[in-house]
């Protein structure tokens, strides 16, 4: 299969593939708000190979308007074709397409994580997956955010092997009794456009000294 | 209804020209991948080309790649298909489908499909 992809808009629909928690998600939007399917079916094919389109057994009549595609979508080399057909009972609403390279189109949400704050530094314990796939692995970086009083410190943890099973990475050398505020995001060699997590916040206990001083009063 | 009236096929020389077209009507054009599929004469049913549904994207088989064009005109509810350097083995009955068709391709076919025949000799 042959394609042509320039930038038009006038598509009835709107896709996002995302890796989430190192699995690949597909998710849809309708420009047209006055079409309600009751389901919809997700098909593909690889524009590499004149194939028919095969349909995703797990997305085929699916009230969700996103798909997993972890399991179908395996080389970030093909470019794959996405076809999502809506329905009203046995009537196809509509039908759009798609063409995704997910070396490209990929984005890459953040990873949950969890932070403890300690006098004088804080442990970030992200959470990855026990088993993330290799070629679902990106070339990603960790990239831990640190704000406080306005000021960023950006740390890139060396991640020993594959992304996977839970991470801690200490921020040390912090000052005591201390607002911190933290966030975490996978960062593409291709300096695509991050998407960063919320923050999460801990005012570090104070040290010994104020604390003796407190008990002083 | 579905309805998909097929035009434009005819006898043609070895590397001429023709263009097909489809009127469409019975559901709304516009949010449709639409595709072409054809039937050689004692062969099954095959895909040529597909095309999104605002027009962005045009897809091809490889028999036809490079020598044939998918368009649309939404305004007017019509696919077109260009063909071009046309080969003895492009012969067939050729039918515009709704959404992108595939096996069985029967199953695309609107109801009363016609198709248009294009030949290719010398």
């Known amino acids: 299969i042959s394609y042509d992809s320039p930038d038009y808009t006038d598509e009835s629909c709107t896709f996002k593939i995302s890796l989430r928690n190192f699995r690949s998600i597909l998710s849809w939007e309708l420009k047209n708000h006055s079409i309600v399917p009751t389901h919809y079916t997700l098909l593909y094919t690889i524009m590499s190979k004149p194939e028919d389109l095969k349909v995703v057994k797990n997305c085929a009549n699916t009230t969700r308007s996103f798909c997993d595609l972890t399991d179908e979508w395996r080389s970030t080399h093909e470019a794959y074709v996405t076809v999502l057909e809506g329905f009203s009972g046995n009537t196809t609403l509509f039908s759009c397409s798609h063409n995704f390279w997910l070396a490209i189109d990929m984005s890459f949400e953040p990873p949950e994580f969890e932070i403890v704050g300690f006098t004088n530094h804080i442990n970030v314990m992200v959470k990855f997956p026990s088993i993330v796939e290799e070629e679902l692995q990106f070339d990603l970086s960790l990239v831990i955010e640190e704000q406080s009083e306005g000021i960023v410190k950006k740390h890139k943890p060396e991640i020993k092997g594959n992304m996977s099973g839970n991470f801690t990475y200490i921020i040390d050398k912090l000052i005591p009794n201390t607002n911190y505020c933290v966030s975490v995001y996978l960062e593409h060699s291709d300096e695509q456009a991050v998407i960063k997590s919320p923050l999460k916040c801990t005012l570090l206990p104070p040290g010994q000294e104020s604390e003796s001083a407190e008990s002083a009063k | 209804q579905v309805q998909l009236q097929e035009s434009g096929g005819g006898l043609v020389q070895p590397g001429g020209s023709l263009t097909l077209s489809c009127a469409a009507s019975?559901?709304?054009?516009?949010?449709?991948?639409m595709s072409w599929v054809r039937q050689a004469p004692g062969k099954g049913l095959e895909w040529v080309s597909a095309i999104s549904s605002g027009g962005g994207n045009t897809y091809y088989a490889d028999s036809v790649k490079g020598r044939f064009t998918i368009s649309r005109d939404n305004a007017k509810s019509t696919l077109y298909l260009q063909l071009n350097s046309l080969k003895t083995e492009d012969t067939a009955m050729y039918y515009c489908t709704k959404d992108w068709a595939r096996p069985p391709y029967s199953d695309f076919l609107a109801p009363q499909a016609q198709g248009t025949q294009v030949t290719v000799s010398s």
């Open positions: 019975g559901f709304t054009f516009r949010n449709h991948i």
